[in-house]
């Protein structure tokens, strides 16, 4: 190991304080007491240290807790968490919340960074699982965090957990998660009256089967244009003109701007024409009147 | 001495796209965070980004979020910034700055962005 | 985002003269604060940081004070290379936010 330097005479650090703002980078490395540091963390926020300044901070405390460092240095990192490479984070176990917001506001209007990505990650794998006060904290701070889970992680989200779910959460999500997702609403939503339902449901319904929809299409529901352009297309294939003709309600005309359109546009090609005609939209490319409907998926399964 | 030197600036239409960068000389530039901030005619300076040195952690200012992406390429001791969906409002002279955490404490001489129809 | 208030927003002095600019932080920024002159088509220097810290090469005419919310940049005797415009800028908190600029200018 390299010969360290020594602390010159009276720089000795009695705490952490904002003279050592005029410290260079050696004489912080020769005399801040580690153990100091690690106890007056909360301090180190309040006074402008340089990136190269925190670097030497941060090598100190590696130092000290080479195992990774304790909870209670790591909620009072502040800023110097920003220092952070995911390979040390890995070696936290984080298990307040409090700490995890701490942390997270620290990093706020930054982009994702992979620090924050391995943050989470200890921290939930910690808990076991996604739970309701968890969920709510990430989706306050990242709105998209929800769909950045694989199908498998979100597998572990209780529907307890669902409540805390808001629209803009899951506007980035695939299908494959929504499918993962809806029998998890359906559940955490299932005592709540039609109308009530139906709000909370809607912005999961793009993992929603065909059975669920031909179910909604009996209680008035409404649903908008952009909702339905986001259901399953394989779920929309199977509905009725009238299924479809109750399920939007007034909405329906805005079927004649969507004909060119997924699943609007494959649902048509399913549908007879004349059955098309009695919406009144002028939609095009229904099966002719006469021609017989056979069911292919069937065939397919046989074979 | 430590240089720093944007160029890649110019008129472009609304909507349209640039990418900015920034050369850097005298400094070892992957030990150093670096800065985006610009400065539109008779206005104040804005600081619109940040990149940590091994471009991990980024920050952007909510007036360019969504549009303006930070980058650098240490192998080269380049920092860029590419700026799309451009608008009037983007008009300014764009500077560079070594960011030391409490100071931004060299600037380059700045590239002109011009956003007009 | 903590907003940054320079005044006076220009300043007439004379070479020789001692010139004090003041800037206030909407919130308390400790001595996250940094100091800077830019002259016309040039870009800004850093002057001081950390509120007080001289940077290297700068004359000690300069000198800044204060912590928390209310700043100063003083030049204690004018010089004409000293005629420019000074910003002050936060670092407490993202985003980094600047004052607005004082314009000192020849009297």
């Known amino acids: 190991e390299v010969e360290k330097t020594a602390c010159p005479s009276g720089k000795k650090a009695r705490e952490i304080d904002e003279s050592l703002i005029f410290y260079k980078k050696w004489e912080l490395e020769a005399c801040v007491d580690a153990a100091l540091l690690a106890t007056q963390m909360d301090r180190v926020n309040a006074i402008p240290f340089t990136y190269e300044q925190l670097d030497v901070l941060k090598h100190k405390l590696d130092e000290l807790y080479p195992q990774g460092y304790p909870e209670s240095v790591i909620q009072h990192l502040g800023y110097l968490f920003l220092k952070m490479s995911p390979e040390d984070i890995r070696k936290w176990n984080v298990t307040s919340l409090e700490t995890l917001k701490a942390l997270l506001e620290v990093n706020k209007g930054h982009e994702m960074s992979p620090q924050v990505a391995t943050l989470i990650d200890r921290f939930v794998k910690g808990r076991g699982q996604l739970d309701k006060d968890t969920l709510d904290t990430l989706t306050a701070f990242y709105p998209g965090y929800l769909c950045s889970l694989s199908p498998e992680e979100l597998s572990s989200v209780p529907p307890s957990s669902i409540w805390a779910v808001r629209p803009q959460d899951l506007d980035t999500c695939d299908p494959r998660q929504l499918d993962v997702l809806y029998p998890k609403a359906r559940l955490a939503f299932q005592n709540m009256n039609g109308s009530e339902y139906f709000v909370k449901i809607q912005s999961f319904l793009g993992g929603a089967p065909t059975e669920d929809l031909k179910a909604l299409s009996q209680q008035n529901v409404s649903m908008d244009l952009a909702t339905f352009m986001k259901l399953r297309t394989d779920a929309v294939l199977p509905l009725t003109v009238a299924e479809v003709q109750k399920l939007l309600g007034p909405h329906v005309e805005g079927l004649k701007a969507e004909e060119r359109h997924r699943p609007v546009r494959d649902w048509i090609l399913r549908q007879r024409q004349d059955d098309l005609d009695t919406l009144g939209l002028g939609l095009q490319g229904g099966i002719p009147n006469g021609y017989l409907v056979l069911d292919l998926s069937m065939q397919e399964a046989l074979s | 001495q430590v240089q720093l030197v944007e160029s890649g600036g110019g008129l472009v239409k609304p909507g349209g796209s640039l990418r900015l960068s920034c050369a850097a000389s005298?400094?070892?530039?992957?030990?150093?965070?670096m800065t985006w901030i610009r400065q539109a005619p008779g206005k104040c300076l804005e600081w619109i980004s940040y990149i940590s040195s091994s471009g991990s952690t980024i920050y952007y200012a909510d007036s360019v979020k969504g549009r303006f992406t930070i980058s650098r390429d240490n192998a080269k001791n380049s920092l860029y910034l590419q700026m799309n969906s451009l608008r009037a409002e983007d008009t300014a002279v764009y500077y560079c700055?070594?960011?030391?955490?409490?100071?931004?404490?060299?600037w380059g001489q700045g590239t002109l962005v011009t956003v007009s129809s | 985002d903590i907003q940054m208030t320079q005044s006076p927003s220009s300043v007439s002095a004379s070479v020789g003269d001692r010139v004090t600019i003041t800037c206030r932080a909407s919130q308390g920024i400790t001595r996250w604060l940094a100091w800077y002159q830019q002259k016309p088509g040039k870009a800004p220097k850093l002057l001081i940081y950390a509120a007080s810290v001289l940077q290297s090469g700068v004359p000690s005419r300069f000198s800044g004070s204060g912590s928390g919310t209310d700043f100063t940049l003083t030049i204690s005797s004018l010089q004409p290379e000293d005629f420019a415009t000074y910003y002050c800028?936060?670092?407490?908190?993202?985003?980094?936010?600047f004052g607005c600029g004082t314009k000192v200018e020849i009297k």
């Open positions: 800028q936060q670092s407490n908190s993202f985003p980094r936010t």
């Open positions: 700055a070594r960011d030391r955490n409490s100071h931004f404490d060299y």
């Open positions: 005298g400094f070892t530039f992957s030990d150093y965070y």
